[in-house]
């Protein structure tokens, strides 16, 4: 039953004389293991014998007999799956059909395989993609329908007979589906490869040539161009003529259109292979190329840089940076269109040549106010000297310079005057916009830079101003030197250090805190009477009569100042004591008599003592001694004594006479 035998192997195998053939093969005998295997060459079925006739290349039987050919032919299979065969070496006459006669216990099968052995090694086959374009990577394939384990081979790629540098990937297949050796080469053809011969060469293990296949490359590419220019260096002067010619060195397929470009932009009405430029101007300087198109696309020539030379144009100056701050660095750049580039420059500041400055740039490391002004330059090349352009203005900004505070008043200034000061400066950029004053006060600024101090104080010493733009510059402080009358005049007792007692030596000092001008005069006064003109008032021996209210005056050329009244107090023991009697020194008995102890004392009397005509002290200690009712026997001489902290004083005797009343006289 044929359906029980299933074989898989290549339909035909290819080899050449002396090589070998490896036949991958699998089978399935469903009714059991293989018992007999015979490999026939060109088997033919003999109907008479019901057997196959033909050369037996290999035979495996139960008795184990094997023909001598078996050394060349090997059955590498097994009893149930593998039917792989090897013939090594293979000969030309091995070409034809190989028949695999398989027998199991119950079944038989003849499987046929074609073997094609050539006399010489057959060539590989190169496969190319349908279209090849320049710079697009393609894969070249070289395929040989041969592979055998016992006969190693190699495939090598050549371009115009020279081995190709690109690495090829070789693969082999020895499977039931296919037997081949393949080499793949990745390759980016250039337009110059067009028409070149590519060879795939078959070699044995030693690199000996066996066979090859060749193809001619058809590389599609844009037109390849060469541009020629007269004059050859493409350097001309204004008014000269220039000719450019475009030559096509290669195009596949053929070109269709021609055009010219300048700086990447197409030139109108220029569609021939020659471009004629007559009486060129500097505007025609630039990069020229020709463009030719075919079906692949446009091709461009290399660019020709046409330089139309001319003398420098009027120059302009660029300043980095204006306005500049004093002390900063500034760079000036001279810009002038010229071809060739200028080789020499002349620089001007406010129309005057700047010595030693011959370069495109001028660098000033520290800008100063007088660097301000107009900077211009002249550029020079081999064709001539340009014109001086309008120049650029450098503005140098700096704080106000030489700031001074000026007193506008006539001198001297007196306390209470209105003082006007102005803040002056020499120069400033930008302009002064405000002023500051030190110290700060509630003063008015009637106009910018002017300060008015109403009722100037004696202690306004110095004032400074600042003129401000973007920066403030302070002037040195100016002294107002305000003149004023002596201040803080007062009387001061120098001696004695303690209280003044009658008879002491006393000195009073007239003090003042300050005076401007310093030259002063002194005056002492008591009760409107001038006492002296020295700074001190001296008493050799003070008396109570000297006590009183004293003032001193100090004056200078501005005015005079009086001290507060100062009270001079002289301390003395009670004096000028006398006893006065009221209503008189003669009093009628029975009436009232009052004796008063009068005295002059400082401090006042603190303690009184009364005495009679016998110098007997009476038990009375107040200033007044009251006798009521008075008696005749009270008649007599009385005196008193006064005491204070300084001492004691006594009065002279005063006589009291008490006379009888009419009643008493009447009774008698």
């Amino acid at each position: 039953d044929s359906s029980k035998w299933v074989f898989e192997h290549p339909e035909t195998l290819y080899a050449w004389e002396g090589a070998c053939v490896w036949i991958p093969c699998t089978y399935r005998a469903l009714d059991g293991d293989l018992e007999s295997f015979i490999l026939f060459h060109n088997p033919e079925y003999n109907k008479n014998t019901s057997k196959f006739d033909g050369t037996r290349l290999y035979e495996s039987t139960k008795d184990g007999k094997v023909p001598s050919e078996q050394k060349r032919v090997q059955f590498l299979g097994d009893k149930n799956k593998n039917c792989t065969l090897s013939i090594h070496p293979v000969h030309l006459n091995d070409s034809g059909q190989l028949g695999l006669r398989m027998e199991s216990k119950t079944e038989k099968w003849m499987e046929r395989i074609h073997l094609n052995v050539s006399e010489r090694p057959f060539p590989p086959h190169i496969q190319l993609p349908p279209e090849i374009q320049e710079s697009q990577e393609v894969t070249l394939t070289c395929l040989l329908n041969f592979s055998c384990y016992g006969y190693p081979i190699q495939l090598q790629w050549l371009l115009e007979g020279v081995p190709m540098r690109q690495a090829a990937v070789t693969s082999t297949s020895l499977t039931i589906k296919s037997v081949f050796t393949r080499s793949e080469l990745k390759f980016s053809p250039q337009w110059s490869h067009h028409g070149k011969i590519v060879t795939c060469q078959l070699q044995d293990a030693d690199g000996k040539f066996l066979s090859n296949d060749t193809v001619q490359l058809n590389v599609k590419h844009t037109p390849k161009l060469e541009i020629k220019v007269t004059p050859s260096d493409a350097i001309v002067r204004e008014g000269d003529s220039v000719t450019m010619t475009c030559e096509v060195s290669s195009s596949n397929p053929e070109y269709t259109t021609v055009s010219w470009l300048k700086d990447g932009t197409s030139l109108k009405k220029q569609n021939t292979f020659t471009l004629n430029l007559r009486e060129v101007t500097k505007d025609q300087s630039g990069k020229y190329c020709c463009q030719v198109s075919n079906d692949v696309g446009p091709g461009r020539s290399e660019e020709v840089f046409l330089q139309v030379q001319y003398a420098p144009e009027p120059s302009t100056v660029q300043i980095l940076h204006s306005p500049a701050v004093e002390g900063s660095q500034v760079e000036f750049l001279c810009m002038s269109l010229a071809n060739p580039l200028p080789t020499n420059y002349t620089w001007y500041h406010n129309g005057k040549e700047m010595q030693g400055r011959t370069e495109e740039k001028v660098h000033i490391p520290k800008i100063l106010p007088w660097h301000a002004g107009t900077y211009s330059c002249v550029a020079e090349n081999i064709l001539g000297t340009g014109q001086r352009g309008p120049g650029a203005e450098l503005d140098v900004q700096y704080p106000p310079k030489k700031v001074t505070t000026v007193i506008q008043n006539p001198m001297p200034i007196r306390e209470g005057d209105t003082v006007t000061l102005s803040c002056n400066y020499n120069s400033s950029n930008p302009s002064v916009t405000r002023y500051e004053w030190k110290p700060h006060g509630a003063w008015e600024e009637p106009s910018l830079g002017v300060l008015k101090i109403q009722n100037v104080g004696w202690d306004n010493t110095t004032i400074a101003c600042a003129a401000c733009n973007s920066w403030c510059s302070w002037a040195s402080p100016v002294a107002l030197n305000v003149q004023y009358a002596p201040r803080d005049v007062r009387v001061r007792k120098i001696k004695p250090l303690s209280e003044i007692h009658s008879g002491n030596s006393v000195s009073l000092q007239c003090d003042f805190s300050s005076s401007h001008p310093k030259e002063v005069q002194f005056f002492w006064e008591k009760n409107g009477r001038l006492l002296g003109k020295e700074s001190q008032l001296n008493f050799d021996s003070i008396s109570p009569e000297d006590a009183g209210s004293y003032s001193c005056w100090v004056n200078n050329s501005i005015g005079q100042t009086a001290s507060k009244a100062w009270t001079l107090e002289v301390l003395y023991a009670p004096r000028r004591l006398r006893v006065s009697m009221s209503p008189g020194d003669q009093v009628m008995e029975g009436k009232s008599a009052t004796l008063t102890c009068e005295s002059d004392a400082n401090p006042p009397v603190s303690h009184y003592t009364w005495f009679d005509w016998n110098n007997q002290s009476l038990p009375y200690h107040s200033q007044k001694l009251r006798l009521e009712p008075v008696k005749v026997q009270h008649s007599g001489a009385y005196w008193c004594q006064g005491t204070n902290s300084v001492g004691k004083g006594r009065s002279p005797l005063s006589t009291l006479t008490v006379y009888y009343s009419p009643e008493t006289i009447g009774r008698r």
Partner: antibody
Framework: EVQLQESGPGLVAPSQSLSITCTVS????????ISWIRQPPGKGLEWLGV???????NYNSAFMSRLSISKDNSKSQVFLKMNSLQTDDTAIYYC???????????WGQGTSVTVSS | DIVLTQSPSSLSASLGGKVTITCKAS??????IAWYQHKPGKGPRLLIH???TLQPGIPSRFSGSGSGRDYSFSISNLEPEDIATYYC????????FGAGTKLELK
Amino acid sequence: EVQLQESGPGLVAPSQSLSITCTVSGFSLTSYDISWIRQPPGKGLEWLGVIWTGGGTNYNSAFMSRLSISKDNSKSQVFLKMNSLQTDDTAIYYCVPHYYGYAMDYWGQGTSVTVSS
Amino acid sequence: DIVLTQSPSSLSASLGGKVTITCKASQDINKYIAWYQHKPGKGPRLLIHYTSTLQPGIPSRFSGSGSGRDYSFSISNLEPEDIATYYCLQYDNLLTFGAGTKLELK
């Protein structure tokens, strides 16, 4: 900080050449011009010549024929060469930086040169 | 070359006094004049540049003025440390020094 260091031979024989190197630091020779100045003993200051930022030179007409000034910006060095020295070329030699519109404010100690056989 | 005529070549002055030195140029030098103080064994010291601009740190006792071809330099309230030789320098057209003025104490 601006610094200038003049280095010379000290003693030169009459009719020989003088070479002095001025090495600068704290500024660039592409921003400042350099002048050479000398002071003979007991005499005043004498300007010899200048090398500008761009490398151009000018000389005092009295020294034009025998003076040469050059520089190496990358090494911050300025060179003075004077030929045919005589005894009256004995002096202290200074190199001094300046720039357009600004006088010389940095002076080194100078280098003393004696011309004697 | 521009010539600078400096005068006097020497002068004596008292401490606290005032001295003036003049410099006359052979052509207009556009205010590009500087004044230097030079003491033995030291490098010259720039006092004033651009006619009247005081260098930082220079006392206001020193002053300068002038224009065109005529320039002057003054020291007021003379101090002992002011004793030196003074030079004018023009830097309008290349450089030229004046001959110098030696200042001595009376």
